[in-house]
């Protein structure tokens, strides 16, 4: 059962796992959610009736029954982890805490103009978990405007105290706002010989990398595969760090793989969601339950639905035994990973999918694309929406992309002459325009947010957000697309598609079926040569064939230029403008979404 509200002046008795310090009960709830075993918590707020050494303590708790006895206590705030909830969760915390000093290892001290600058510094420093900034009103003259970057083993403060005229906050790496390099490669036959901060068991290097990514101290990792010569180290995932943040020594060793934390490219890859099955593999751990199940998929479902289950092993039924049902072993451990991994016993193992909601929804697998055709199939582009106007009569106006459960990203030029959001309708999960009838459900638009620097499509800033009146329930036919991460600015996308119901030639009509075209990106340099009379800025991106023939056209505006990278689709561009349609040496010009990620996050996360 999902309980989101906090219980004031209430303490949960017993069940303690560990105590951390957090600046608020809200953040305590997030920490509890991300902890592998925490189901409930009790936070102590600052209060005259409470011992100051207990202020800001966040006690993480577990219970076999998923609840604990409640006791009245002033200044205590209790609640439940979001593990029990189906909504998406994020570790992103942009709050600034006034007059609080969050203690940790102060490893860097420098002058900063503002708390925001200090937070940016923390976000762009590989070791930084949180910061404290002494404002210009700080009593001690030599400490004014000092920005202290801090880290701890857990990523949370070791203590929090009241201190006048300082502010504290967290790194925004988990908000995908870091400019740090994002290194996705996994290096075969490589061991990084730096200090280990932790070790866990993992079935493959990809899971090891994901564990490293959400471990607060891990910057890179080494994984020993099941063919590693030393038996006791097989499937061992070593989580590592170094002072520089980079591996200092790289040793060539067969059957080992190494790679980096993906903390700076976190929003465009699944980090918590280990969805694969591992055949002929047994995961060992504390047994939670043994249930009969028809298949390993059914076993995974059972694990996902049992809030305390972290991983499972399924042993298929012996012929005609137990109505063809096998045994499903639901398991857990202190850190969420198996305590040992065994091979050759015939089991099929995997992880709960409960944590998938901690990843951005946009990273989950979608239907494979049908290559070759120009007409799309249902569910192929589940983020694509058709935006209709109802005035003077109802018609398709523009395309758009779902980027959040209440947000559509589209082009600003679509709203020329649109006086009010009331005349707009957003239809999602649509393949054919003919599906849209009087009674077809749609999303009303609450607000149109146009970039305040927008004047006309050709001069840039052709970007707008639509805030929907109701939230989108994600399904296979309607789900979000990932925004490109700033850490991925230099990715060269080679698999890009433009989609829409727009014209197929300059003088044409809106198409019934959603059309798609694979189009190569063109450098801005090349694009500028094709548009001598315009300024192609870095906030624009171009795509098209030299010979023409495939392009976006009238009616596609606002729709996505979607590029697949590392198995995840990214919204690289928004269809904006071009000279004619599909003309030779006239590429289409798109809004370069990566340049607007900050603007998008600012608008969509505003309270």
């Amino acid at each position: 059962e999902c309980v989101t509200q906090l219980l004031k002046d209430t303490c949960f008795e017993g069940g303690d796992i560990t105590t951390v310090f957090t600046p608020s009960a809200k953040y305590c709830q997030v920490v509890c959610t991300y902890h592998p075993r925490c189901l409930l918590f009790t936070f102590t707020a600052e209060s005259p009736s409470e011992d100051p050494t207990r202020w800001f303590t966040c006690v993480l708790k577990d219970s076999v029954t998923e609840t604990l006895p409640r006791v009245n206590r002033t200044a205590a705030i209790s609640g439940y982890s979001f593990k029990q909830c189906s909504h998406q969760i994020s570790a992103c915390n942009k709050d600034i805490y006034v007059d609080l000093d969050m203690k940790g290892i102060n490893y860097n001290s420098s002058v900063a103009k503002s708390a925001q600058e200090c937070q940016e510094r923390c976000t762009d420093d590989v070791h930084c978990h949180f910061f404290t900034y002494a404002t210009r009103q700080f009593p001690s003259l030599e400490h004014r405007n000092i920005c202290l970057l801090k880290h701890t083993q857990t990523g949370t403060p070791t203590r929090i105290t009241k201190l006048d005229k300082v502010v504290s906050g967290f790194s925004l790496k988990s908000c995908a706002l870091s400019n740090l390099a994002c290194i996705r490669d996994i290096f075969p036959n490589t061991v990084f010989a730096d200090s280990n901060i932790d070790s866990v068991m993992a079935p493959d290097a990809f899971v090891c990398g994901r564990i490293c990514t959400h471990h607060p101290g891990c910057l890179f990792f080494t994984f020993f595969s099941q063919e590693w010569p030393k038996e006791s180290q097989r499937n061992l995932c070593l989580l590592k760090t170094s002072e520089s943040g980079l591996p200092s020594t790289r040793i060539k060793k067969s059957k080992a793989l190494s790679g980096f934390s993906l903390q700076s490219c976190r929003h465009s890859i699944p980090v918590f969601c280990h969805s694969s099955f591992y055949h002929d593999t047994d995961f060992l751990g504390e047994e939670l339950d043994i249930v009969a199940a028809k298949s390993h998929e059914a076993c995974q479902k059972l694990c996902t639905n049992a809030v305390r289950c972290q991983f499972f092993t399924y042993t298929p039924a012996q012929a005609s035994c137990n109505e063809g049902k096998g045994k499903c072993y639901l398991k857990l451990s202190s850190n969420g990973s198996p305590t040992k991994i065994l091979h050759g016993r015939g089991g099929i193992s995997g992880y709960t999918l409960r944590l998938c909601k901690m990843d951005n929804e946009c990273t989950t697998k979608i239907k494979p694309r049908i290559v070759g055709g120009t007409a799309s199939v249902r569910g192929e582009w589940p983020w694509q929406v058709t935006l209709h106007t109802t005035s003077p009569t109802q018609r398709h106006l523009c395309g758009g992309s779902i980027i959040g459960n209440q947000w559509i990203l589209t082009a600003a030029h679509c709203f020329y002459g649109v006086e009010s959001p009331k005349i707009l309708r957003v239809y999602s999960g649509i393949l054919n325009q003919s599906e849209i009838k009087e009674d077809t459900s749609f999303f009303g638009v609450q607000e149109i947010i146009i970039h305040d620097q927008y004047k006309m499509a050709e001069s840039g800033y052709d970007i707008a957000l639509l805030k929907l009146e109701t939230t989108v329930n994600y399904t296979d036919s309607q789900r979000p697309i990932c925004l490109p991460s700033k850490g991925d600015r230099n990715v060269i996308y080679t698999d890009c598609w433009v989609t829409g119901w727009g014209y197929r030639k300059l003088r044409d009509k809106i198409q019934n079926t959603l059309q798609k075209a694979k189009i190569p990106l063109v450098t801005n340099e090349e694009c500028q040569k094709r548009y001598r009379g315009h300024k192609i800025t870095h906030k624009m991106i171009c795509a098209g064939y030299r010979e023409g023939g495939k392009d976006a056209c009238k009616g596609d505006s606002g729709g996505p230029l979607s590029c697949k990278h590392n198995e995840v689709w990214h919204l690289v561009g928004i269809t904006s403008w071009g000279e004619g349609c599909a003309q030779r040496e006239r590429p289409g010009v798109y809004t370069n979404v990566v340049e607007y990620v900050d603007w998008i996050l600012e608008k969509t996360q505003a309270v």
Partner: nanobody, 124 residues
């Protein structure tokens, strides 16, 4: 003592090419972020391109993408910048820089070691 020495600058017509080199002593390019930065007359330092040798991840400023190519030769401990289709706005002093930590690749504030610079002049 760390020394980075740039060479290969000079004057060239618009549309021409140049190849800059940066030789390092006392610092290894291998396994560090290294990059090229430039400063045009009267302007601030701008990140041009960077490379992280492990896996060869490369990073470019939008203004040079498709025209400039960064590379390194670990055996010679030398960094290169091949500059094609040069434009007058590429005129600047080009600096080679080396970091000793994981950095935002094109952020000059985070690089520790710097060369003296080499002047590139592109005339129209």
């Amino acid at each position: 003592q760390v020394q980075l020495v740039e060479s290969g600058g000079g004057s060239v017509q618009a549309g021409g090419s140049l190849r800059l080199s940066c030789a390092a002593s006392g610092y290894t390019f291998n396994n560090n972020f290294v990059g090229w930065f430039r400063q045009a007359p009267g302007k601030g330092l701008e990140g041009v391109s960077a490379i992280y040798s492990l896996g060869g991840s490369t990073y470019y400023a939008d203004s040079v993408k498709g025209r400039f190519t960064i590379s390194q030769d670990n055996s010679k401990n030398t960094l290169y910048l091949q500059m094609n289709s040069l434009k007058p706005e590429d005129t600047a002093v080009y600096y080679c820089a080396g970091a000793i930590t994981w950095v935002p690749p094109l952020s000059h504030r985070r690089y520790t070691y710097w060369g003296q610079g080499t002047l590139v002049t592109v005339s129209s």
